[in-house]
């Protein structure tokens, strides 16, 4: 995934942690925080596998590259990261696996260059509406954002909440339409049953979405018609049983799109046979050639390109008197 | 339309405490600093220190970190700056203001400065 | 702390005469994300202060084109091209780069 990367190469350690109290005199903008190594002249800051329980108050004003990965956040409070002046450089944000369960309601605010934000291999249990957004407003000014890393942010299923997942995560990435510009979108590895419908609709700048490993049956509610920008969508490793024709034809409109569906349990019968027909002559299906029937038994293995409408067949439904307990 | 809603004065005895609002209204509370502001009669400005209401994280400065103690009410959206010890020394008015990003450009989203001031509460320190 | 020197402290114009005046910090206010949050506010009798100018030379909305900012590292400058009747009042200029923020002693601008 394209988490933040830096080029640092002279970080300068800190002294040992000192806790400071929430009402402290903020120190010189320049030095590093405890517990973290800094390069100002990489403009990046590493806070990492530090066992951290909060985001440090004395973050360098110079940082553009800010890792807090490997910590134990547990909650991102509202302004985390508000600091007065603001962390204006800040782009590229990396907390992925640092134990966050909760991301409140503005815990990005006044990070107005941040155009990166990886929160991957957190257990998301909740997930503010307006974690992204800021506001409850219905139009919240516009986020920065550009690339959005949301891999493997699942909770174990005894601290869902029990409300749908997938609606905490859409409802975060819809709330006042701040997202309108973000180009990449990762959602790998969420055990993702369904995808809302209005979801894609209202993310038109999509160049690049990640929905791979997760559990998704169908894509026939699904809309791709408006992502006219995308250019790579990622759909291995799902439980999609079959294209259809709205879908495929969507697909086929997008101009520069490319298609992953490996590692799909696709299912080789009557219903198929329009799929098989567009994979012969769309361009768009990456390793298309890859691609093998699950099911039903008699056809398992075989390569969906080398089929043709005679193998692709339903048995029939006998009329209930035919039909045996 | 963003407002700052400050009583107008408070008469206290020296060594008593006070504790005086600021309501805010017609904007997201939780999105913006409270900066507090002191002056005395035909006197300067001097930052006393701000506080971020999403997180109740507060900055002072260091003149008036015994003196002063900045605290919010989310649920009433109303920011609260208590003084202490008083003597006549502290005998101003009092603003407050909100600081924080400046939507008047999308050129410059780093753009913050104090956009919208209280009408300032006048403290009168007298036996 | 970051000492702010305004200068003058009483400017006496006559209306549509030009105004300027200066702003001198004690050290840089250049943060070191690269931007200066040096502010400019008006304060008219009886009144809170008034947001005019932010980092330097951006005029916040409202404020009429004859007010103009400009300076950097240490110098700044506030101009008012021709004074009107409304632009009376105590005028001060900010630093929020560095802790504690500071503001100047202010320059009263009157009429002649």
């Known amino acids: 995934s394209s988490s933040p990367t830096s080029s640092a190469s002279s970080f300068s350690s800190s002294a040992p942690f000192l806790a400071s109290a929430v009402s402290a005199q903020p120190p010189l903008p320049d030095q590093c925080p405890a517990l973290c190594e800094c390069s100002e002249a990489a403009r990046t800051v590493k806070c990492v596998n530090r066992n951290l329980t909060e985001v440090p108050t004395d973050l360098p004003a110079y940082v553009r590259n800010l890792f807090l990965t490997g910590n134990q956040l547990a909650v991102l409070p509202a302004g985390a990261f508000a600091r007065r002046p603001p962390l204006a450089e800040l782009a590229a944000l990396n907390l992925s696996g640092s134990r966050l369960d909760e991301v409140r309601a503005g815990a990005f605010e006044h990070l107005p260059s941040l155009r990166q934000l990886d929160l991957s291999h957190n257990p998301l249990a909740d997930l503010s509406p307006f974690a992204f957004s800021g506001s409850n407003a219905s139009v919240s000014a516009p986020s920065p954002l550009v690339e959005l890393i949301l891999n493997h942010i699942v909770p174990p299923e005894d601290e869902r909440q029990n409300r749908s997942f997938e609606g905490m995560v859409v409802a975060a990435l819809l709330a006042g339409r701040a997202l309108q510009g973000l180009r990449r979108l990762e959602l790998a590895s969420n055990h993702f049953l369904y995808l809302p419908r209005d979801v894609l609709a209202q993310l038109p700048s999509l160049r690049h979405l990640d929905l791979s490993n997760n559990s998704l049956v169908s894509l026939t509610y699904v809309s791709f018609r408006n992502l006219t920008h995308l250019e790579s969508l990622h759909l291995e490793d799902n439980a999609l049983k079959v294209l259809h024709n709205g879908t495929l034809a969507e697909l086929q409109g997008l101009p520069h799109i490319r298609v992953f569906l490996d590692n799909n349990p696709w299912v080789c019968d009557c219903h198929m046979a329009d799929m098989v027909t567009w994979l012969k002559e769309t361009e768009v299906v990456q390793g298309k050639d890859r691609l093998t029937c699950a099911y039903p038994e008699k056809m398992r293995n075989r390569v969906l390109l080398e089929l043709n409408s005679a193998d692709l067949d339903c048995d029939p439904i006998l009329p209930p008197s035919l039909q045996t307990s | 339309q963003v407002q700052l809603q400050q009583p107008g004065a408070e008469l206290v005895k020296p060594g008593a405490s006070v504790k005086m609002s600021c309501k805010a209204s017609?904007?997201?509370?939780?999105s913006y600093w409270i900066t507090w502001v002191k002056q005395r009669p035909g006197q300067g400005l001097e930052w006393?220190?701000?506080?971020?209401?999403?997180?109740?994280?507060?900055n002072y400065n260091e003149k008036f970190k015994s003196k002063a103690t900045l605290t919010v009410d989310t649920s009433s959206s109303t920011a609260y700056m208590q003084l202490s010890s008083l003597t006549s020394e502290d005998s101003a008015v009092y603003n407050c203001?909100?600081?924080?990003?400046?939507?008047?450009?999308?050129?410059?989203?780093?753009?913050?400065?104090?956009?919208?001031w209280g009408q300032g509460t006048s403290v009168t320190v007298s036996s | 702390d970051v000492l702010m020197t305004q200068t003058p402290l009483s400017l006496p114009v006559s209306l549509g005469d030009q105004a300027s005046i200066s702003c001198r910090s004690s050290?840089?206010?250049?943060?070191?994300?690269?931007?200066?949050?040096l502010e400019w506010y008006l304060q008219k009798p009886g009144q809170s202060p008034k947001l005019l100018i932010y980092?330097?030379?951006n005029r916040f909305s409202g404020v009429p084109d004859r007010f103009s900012g400009s300076g950097s590292g240490t110098d700044f400058t506030l101009k008012i091209s021709r004074v009107e009747a409304e632009d009376l009042g105590v005028y001060y200029c900010?630093?929020?780069?560095?802790?504690?923020?500071?503001f100047g002693s202010g320059t009263k601008l009157e009429i002649k």
């Open positions: 980092k330097v030379s």
């Open positions: 900010f630093q929020g780069s560095h802790v504690p923020f500071t």
């Open positions: 006393i220190g701000d506080i971020y209401p999403g997180s109740g994280r507060a």
């Open positions: 050290q840089s206010i250049v943060y070191s994300n690269g931007n200066t949050y």
């Open positions: 203001a909100r600081y924080g990003p400046l939507f008047t450009t999308v050129v410059d989203p780093n753009s913050y400065a104090m956009d919208y």
């Open positions: 017609g904007y997201t509370f939780t």
